[in-house]
Interface confidence: low
């Protein structure tokens, strides 16, 4: 008996071939011997089966001795043995129809779980293997679960159902809702304008929700909400903003925040959360601000940084075009009685300069100038 696998909602064509290459009488029946369709001369006739409105054949092939049964919009319950009767012969074809669905929304938040459920006909024992867009393979029976979805899981999941050495392939499009970056860090000199950007890693027609930026300043004992906003069809509107600092927010995506000035009291870490309409859970992106200040007080030239710096970062003070006078893995360095000239304060990571501030030290009778 020939086995054919079909996909729920798809169309399948079951073949039936006569030895005579001409149009002769045929009919298709199901396992209960109920007629599905057949011919009367050149006319297609349909029987009383439940397939009535979904069954068809190809009259253009009858003259070649081919009498296919086409079943449209397949249902799991169409799984059956179909019998083609032609030339006093019977050809049997077993049709097994499978369905694979994501049992939740196909738009899922990063970190959430995806469950794929296989619908299969009674008596079948299929195995399923799915391949994620990043090439990860998962195997299972009637259900497959993937926990902790990552951004790279967005895209087309290809699932292969295997039964009786035959296979059928399903493609399911999954969107992992997340920010492009989990975390970012901005390095600024004191007084400079700060731009924070929060690009999303997905595109949808309509995006509605609300968000908030909580900020934990390094100098503060607790975090505070800097801004809350609404998102309606990709348009951003500010609901509430603190007076200090007075953040500005772009009206369009990607989410964009401007801090007018980088000041030591603002240095720290923020967490932007975005709650999307009809979704449980929130998207998160961490953002960090490091602020540098170089000052000269009396005979002491000081360079300081505030904010979340890693212990491997190096802070240096050097006279322009000369070797570093002082270089430490600390958040403040200083030089006593600095020579006159242009001094550079450098924050670097493995030789790569992340932040630089220049200060001009005048001969001792003058006051310093900060360019």
């Amino acid at each position: 008996k020939k086995v054919v696998l079909g996909k729920k909602g798809d169309t399948v064509e079951l073949t039936c071939t006569a030895s005579q290459k001409k149009s002769i009488q045929f009919h298709w029946k199901n396992s209960n011997q109920i007629k599905i369709l057949g011919n009367q001369g050149s006319f297609l006739t349909k029987g009383p089966s439940k397939l009535n409105d979904r069954a068809d054949s190809r009259r253009s092939l009858w003259d070649q001795g081919n009498f296919p049964l086409i079943i449209k919009n397949l249902k799991i319950e169409d799984s059956d043995t179909y019998i083609c009767e032609v030339e006093d012969q019977k050809e049997e074809v077993q049709l097994l129809v499978f369905g694979l669905t994501a049992n939740s929304d196909t738009h899922l938040l990063q970190g959430q779980s995806l469950t794929l459920t296989l619908e299969s006909p009674p008596g079948s024992s299929p195995s399923v293997q799915c391949r994620s867009p990043r090439g990860k393979n998962i195997q299972g029976g009637k259900t497959l679960s993937v926990s902790q979805l990552e951004l790279q899981d967005s895209g087309t999941w290809t699932c292969t159902v295997l039964q009786n050495q035959k296979k059928v392939e399903f493609k399911i499009d999954i969107v992992v809702l997340a920010f492009q970056k989990a975390s970012s860090i901005v390095y600024k000199k004191e007084g400079e304008q700060v731009e924070f950007s929060f690009p999303l890693a997905f595109t949808v027609e309509k995006l509605t929700g609300s968000g908030e930026l909580w900020w934990q300043a390094e100098r503060a004992s607790s975090s505070k909400s800097w801004i809350t906003f609404d998102l309606k069809n990709k348009e951003v509107s500010v609901k509430r903003v603190t007076q200090d600092p007075k953040l500005q927010m772009g009206k369009k995506l990607p989410l964009h925040l401007t801090l007018p000035q980088a000041l030591p009291q603002y240095a720290g870490s923020g967490n932007l959360t975005l709650a999307l309409e009809a979704k449980t859970g929130k998207l998160h992106q961490e953002v960090n601000l490091v602020v540098m200040r170089a000052t000269q007080l009396q005979k002491n030239l000081t360079c300081e940084v505030w904010g979340p710096t890693s212990p491997k970062l190096m802070l240096s003070l050097k006279l322009e075009n000369k070797e570093a006078k002082v270089s430490k893995r600390e958040k403040a360095v200083w030089v006593l009685n600095p020579e006159a000239g242009m001094w550079q304060c450098l924050l670097s990571d493995s030789g790569q300069v992340l932040l630089e501030s220049n200060i001009k030290v005048l001969p001792t009778w003058s006051t310093p100038v900060q360019p």
Partner: antibody, heavy 120, light 107 residues
Framework: QVQLQESGPGLVKPSETLSLTCTVS????????WSWIRQPAGKGLEWIGR???????NYNPSLKSRVTMSVDTSKNQFSLKLSSVTAADTAVYYC??????????????WGQGTTVTVSS | DIQMTQSPSSLSASVGDRVTITCQAS??????LNWYQQKPGKAPKLLIY???NLETGVPSRFSGSGSGTDFTFTISSLQPEDIATYYC?????????FGQGTRLEIK
């Protein structure tokens, strides 16, 4: 924006191994598939394969026995090695980024290509 | 492997003409098809993804349609800068395969 630059010897002797490197600048190499494609002079495009991580590669079956791809995230580079080359491997070799996601996919960023000639 | 057959292999048209290129897959590939433009001495450039979606920054005179095995790429009004070779590419299954290309010239 992201830019790709192929590098490697322009001339390789028959039976030797062709080695090319693609350097990614202006963006991270992580989180994307990266493909190699070649094009003999005056001919069409042939996909060689792609890499996501060192453990996750897909090669064209017609070249699989001779191809090795690797990625170095610390240098933002990925590489192609093609062994036992013949004159038929003479082509312009391109590296490209495979963009995958919801309802889209395409090689959206390409290097400018590097010509490799196999000759003794 | 899925074979991709483009036609015609070359065509000549005048500025302002509507130009159509077809691509046929050897099996059903749903809408998993892209179109690329390649100018002489340059790398290919993605124009259309998923059969009918215009890549960001690509002029709207370019369009794509089709599903299953038969696909069409259209330039609604040919411009001099459109002189190039155009390739279709399937990604329904690995290995990724390209059509043989259609060379477009100005009359």
């Amino acid at each position: 924006q992201v830019q790709l630059q192929e590098s490697g010897p322009g001339l390789v002797k028959p039976s030797e191994t062709l080695s090319l490197t693609c350097t990614v600048s202006g963006g991270s190499i992580s989180g994307f598939y990266w493909s190699w494609i070649r094009q003999p002079a005056g001919k069409g495009l042939e996909w060689i394969g792609r890499i996501y991580t060192s453990e996750n590669t897909n090669y064209n079956p017609s070249l699989k026995s001779r191809v090795t791809m690797s990625v170095d995230t610390s240098k933002n580079q990925f590489s192609l090695k093609l062994s036992s080359v013949t004159a038929a491997d003479t082509a312009v070799y391109y590296c490209a980024r495979d963009r995958e996601g919801y309802y889209y996919y395409g090689m959206d960023v390409w290097g400018q290509g590097t010509t490799v000639t196999v000759s003794s | 492997d899925i074979q991709m057959t483009q036609s015609p292999s070359s065509l000549s048209a005048s500025v302002g003409d509507r130009v159509t290129i077809t691509c046929q897959a050897s099996q059903d590939i749903s809408n998993y098809l892209n179109w690329y433009q390649q100018k002489p001495g340059k790398a290919p450039k993605l124009l259309i993804y998923a059969a009918s979606n215009l890549e960001t920054g690509v002029p709207s005179r370019f369009s794509g349609s089709g599903s299953g095995t038969d696909f069409t790429f259209t330039i609604s009004s040919l411009q001099p800068e459109d002189i190039a070779t155009y390739y279709c590419q399937q990604y329904d299954s690995l290995p990724i395969t390209f059509g043989q290309g259609t060379r477009l010239e100005i009359k």
